[in-house]
């Protein structure tokens, strides 16, 4: 997958919706300049392509939704990379521009005669891409041409700004909410001193900024904050891990506002450096409950607490997807490449893969083996349905009493479509209400996951809580088998009775040394000792002073002991 030739998946229709999915991993650092993408992806790639194709089939066969109008699509690969996604978005735009010029009769042949050639239909809207950084770049281009964009996993807070990203909407909440959820978890377990890591790029940067702001307000200190690219080399991850280690044993919790592949990079570095079990990772929804993050590095991931957008599996998608086979699935141009990669075998008639795999694919192979549905599948499908309902409402309003596309919808006006989309509300694939606020955002509901060793060499994610509209619920007994097992992540222990906190110059407020008050002093507040007034003495609990009772000497009392100044 280099920049020379890009594969596209097409499905014909009266209205064409564009989609950007990360069919392949992002280019590695050394391949970025040539935009050569990495290996094919199943959950984030192939499953999403198939979800688009099959969801459109379902919509097209639903007599109540867009009757007499067929939705088609053009799916392109973003490779989770801005440069690739922009290149692909330009292709969407180019199709739209040529089509609109045709509508206005501007396309003429070289000899001056008019053309009978029909180019592709324009893209009315775009679904995706997954990454916030990439979505921002794509939106910057799409909004110039009034093309609405509906994202299914780009959660950056920046995208809520409608002055900057007018044509952007999403079926997921803004990251401000999961940053709050992460802070609430940190607070719950009295972790007052944590390290912070984020993925370079908009998702990680804005999310971590929110996490740090909220932490400061709650009296949580950040030992140090680090950033790294998901595709950074081993050496960069090793260096980052060493830096995190320098904050042990105080900052055992590492809050990671990270993409899944950043977390994987950290886990791999933990293995290399012999640091399994030294940290507790608190991960954002980039990690969620993804097995491609932890596979092969489960020991390093054990104990991890992650945030996952609430989205149950979609059963009807599995019913469709698990029956797919390479010999019959020709509409997905990446499917054969994926099949070979998934089963590490060679399909007959695909010479480009010959060098990679020696064994031929067995005909008994099935996707049912080790199948895991993409954790964001529900959002992908909801995004597609949002576009369909938006178009449906627009058709009802512009073409009353007319089944199909009336002239008022030819060509589709992106401004009117955006208006219609913003007003859309419907019951989503999981039974929840899908609606958009004035920023084009959806409400936030999260599940809290915990990665655990369930048995000998068997690891899994379990649901240990939820965060819904500001309320955190956690099953503490499920996370920690005993109260004493709760990990401590504090810089300094509380001071003993009669001691005050002395914060060293340049240190954060969570780090102090405990100093006892002098003999004649009491603890005025946690940072100050104060001397008792003449004639009074500190109380036993050192919280104040009591008057010293005056004792008068009488004849016959033993003489008092005197101490020289030299006596200590």
């Amino acid at each position: 997958q280099s920049s020379e030739r890009r594969v596209v998946a097409h499905m014909p229709g009266d209205i064409i919706i564009g989609a950007l999915f990360s069919v392949h991993h992002q280019p590695t650092v050394d391949k970025v300049h040539e935009r050569k993408c990495g290996a094919v992806r199943e959950q984030y790639g192939i499953q999403r392509v198939e979800a688009m194709l099959h969801t459109l089939e379902r919509i097209n066969s639903d007599p109540t939704l867009l009757p007499n109008i067929t939705l088609g699509c053009e799916i392109r690969d973003s490779c989770w990379h801005s440069a690739v996604a922009l290149e692909q978005s330009i292709e969407f735009i180019r199709d739209s521009l040529i089509s609109s010029e045709e509508e206005e009769g501007l396309v003429r042949c070289v000899d001056g005669s008019s053309s009978s050639f029909r180019s592709k239909k324009p893209i009315v809207g775009v679904i995706g891409p997954g990454s916030s950084s990439v979505a921002i770049q794509v939106q910057n281009l799409l909004q110039l041409f009034n093309i609405p964009q509906i994202a299914y996993s780009a959660t950056s807070m920046d995208l809520s700004d409608k002055t900057l990203f007018k044509y952007f909407m999403r079926v997921v909440p803004s990251d401000a909410q999961q940053a709050r959820a992460m802070v609430d978890i940190v607070k719950r377990y009295n972790w007052t001193y944590v390290s912070a890591v984020h993925t370079e790029g908009n998702y990680g940067e804005s999310g971590m900024e929110a996490f740090k702001d909220m932490s400061a307000k709650e009296g949580i200190c950040i030992a140090h904050s680090y950033k790294i690219y998901s595709n950074a080399g081993e050496q960069s991850f090793d260096k980052l891990l060493k830096k995190l280690t320098s904050h042990l044993p105080k900052a055992r919790v590492v809050a990671c506002f990270c993409e899944g592949m950043t977390v994987r990079g950290l886990l791999m570095a933990m293995r290399r450096l012999g640091l399994a079990g030294e940290f507790l990772l608190l991960g954002s929804d980039g990690w969620a409950d993804r097995y491609d993050v932890t596979d092969g590095y489960q020991r390093e991931a054990v104990g991890g607490i992650t945030i996952k957008l609430q989205s149950p599996d979609v059963k009807w998608f599995d019913d469709y997807y698990l029956k797919l086979r390479p010999e019959t699935n020709h509409r997905n141009p990446w499917f054969q490449e994926f099949w070979q990669h998934r089963f590490q075998c060679r399909l007959e008639g695909f010479p480009q893969e010959n060098s990679k795999y020696n064994k031929t694919c067995d005909s008994s192979l099935t996707l049912k083996t080790h199948h895991v549905q993409d954790s964001k599948m529900g959002f992908v499908i909801n995004a597609i349905y949002s576009m369909a309902y938006g178009l449906h409402n627009m058709q009802m309003s512009l073409c009353p009493g007319y089944a199909g596309l009336c002239d008022a919808m030819k060509p589709i006006d992106g401004r009117k479509l955006l208006e219609s989309l913003m007003k859309t509300n419907f019951t989503g694939v999981s039974g929840d209400m899908i609606l958009f606020d004035e920023n084009g955002d959806s409400p936030g509901r999260y599940e809290i996951m915990n990665f655990k060793e369930m048995g000998k060499d068997y690891f899994d994610y379990i649901n240990v809580g939820s965060w819904d509209n500001g309320e955190l619920k956690m099953d503490d007994d499920e996370v920690w088998s005993k109260k004493s097992n709760i990990i401590r992540s504090v810089c300094s222990e509380p001071c003993e009775k009669g001691q005050i906190k002395v914060i060293r110059k340049g240190e954060v407020s969570c780090c102090w040394t405990c100093t006892p008050c002098k003999e004649n002093e009491y603890v005025f507040d946690e940072y100050t000792c104060k001397a008792c007034q003449l004639g009074s003495w500190p109380t036993d609990d050192l919280t104040g002073c009591d008057l010293i009772p005056v004792q008068y000497l009488r004849w016959g009392d033993p003489e008092p002991d005197y101490k020289d100044d030299d006596d200590k």
């Epitope: 060493k242 044993p249 450096l273 012999g274």
Partner: antibody, heavy 117, light 110 residues
């Protein structure tokens, strides 16, 4: 801040032996501790490490025969199935960080273990 | 397994001369190489950490350099007190290794 090894003595092959490293002036929660040995006239040979958290790693040749453990002020090295090849001065050394292997800033004087029949 | 190969095993140097000791790691250890000096009957003493940083109280005639897999300890203006055995040590990982130290280099000062 100091570390001091003890427990080295003359033993016969096959006898188990436990060495102790006593530390003062710092907390074992904050530093990893290493065991290193040196046979007479030979180079330094790393045996293993115990982190502040209690996690342990051993040299591949030492796995199964050597076990490190700790209390609040001591680190023990339990040795089993000793042979004459295990005759050496055993050092305890403090690592710079609480976990991972880094560099050794504080060494004990060593304790001599002699295995002979 | 990660192995540290140290050369030479022994070197003779005149007072005031320069001695160079090399250490090669079998894999990239970034800059996590330390150097120790050990005199007879004494425990080793840290000279250099993180490839080039001088440990506290160590004279500036000791210099560490290198990164990745190749590391060097250079002693310039050698003094009689520098007669000792020098060891390199990887500070990369304790996992799956036979030894974190190199084989040692004996420096004889004439």
């Amino acid at each position: 801040q100091s570390v001091e090894e003890s427990g080295g003595r003359l033993v016969t092959p096959g006898t188990p032996l436990t060495l102790t490293c006593t530390v003062s002036g710092f907390s074992l929660n904050n530093y990893a501790m290493n065991w290193i040995r040196q046979a007479p006239g030979k180079g330094l040979e790393w045996i293993g490490i115990i982190y502040g958290s209690g996690s342990t790693y051993y040299a591949s040749w030492a796995k199964g025969r050597f076990t490190a453990s700790k209390t609040s002020t001591t680190v023990d090295l339990k040795m089993t199935s000793l042979t004459t090849e295990d005759t050496a001065t055993y050092f305890c050394a403090r690592d710079e960080l609480a976990a991972g292997i880094n560099y050794f800033t504080l060494w004990g004087q060593g304790t001599l273990v002699t295995v002979s029949s | 397994a990660l192995v540290m190969t140290q050369t030479p095993a022994s070197v003779e140097v005149a007072v005031g001369g320069t001695v160079t000791i090399k250490c090669q790691a079998s894999q990239n250890i970034i800059d996590w190489c330390s150097w120790y000096q050990q005199k007879l009957g004494q425990p080793p003493k840290l000279l250099i950490y993180e490839a080039s940083k001088l440990a506290s109280g160590v004279p500036s005639r000791f210099k560490g350099s290198g990164s990745g897999t190749q590391f060097t300890l250079t002693i310039s203006g050698v003094e009689c007190a520098d007669a000792a055995t020098y060891y390199c040590q990887q500070g990369y990982s304790p996992s799956g290794v036979d030894n974190v130290f190199g084989g040692g280099t004996e420096v004889v000062v004439k």
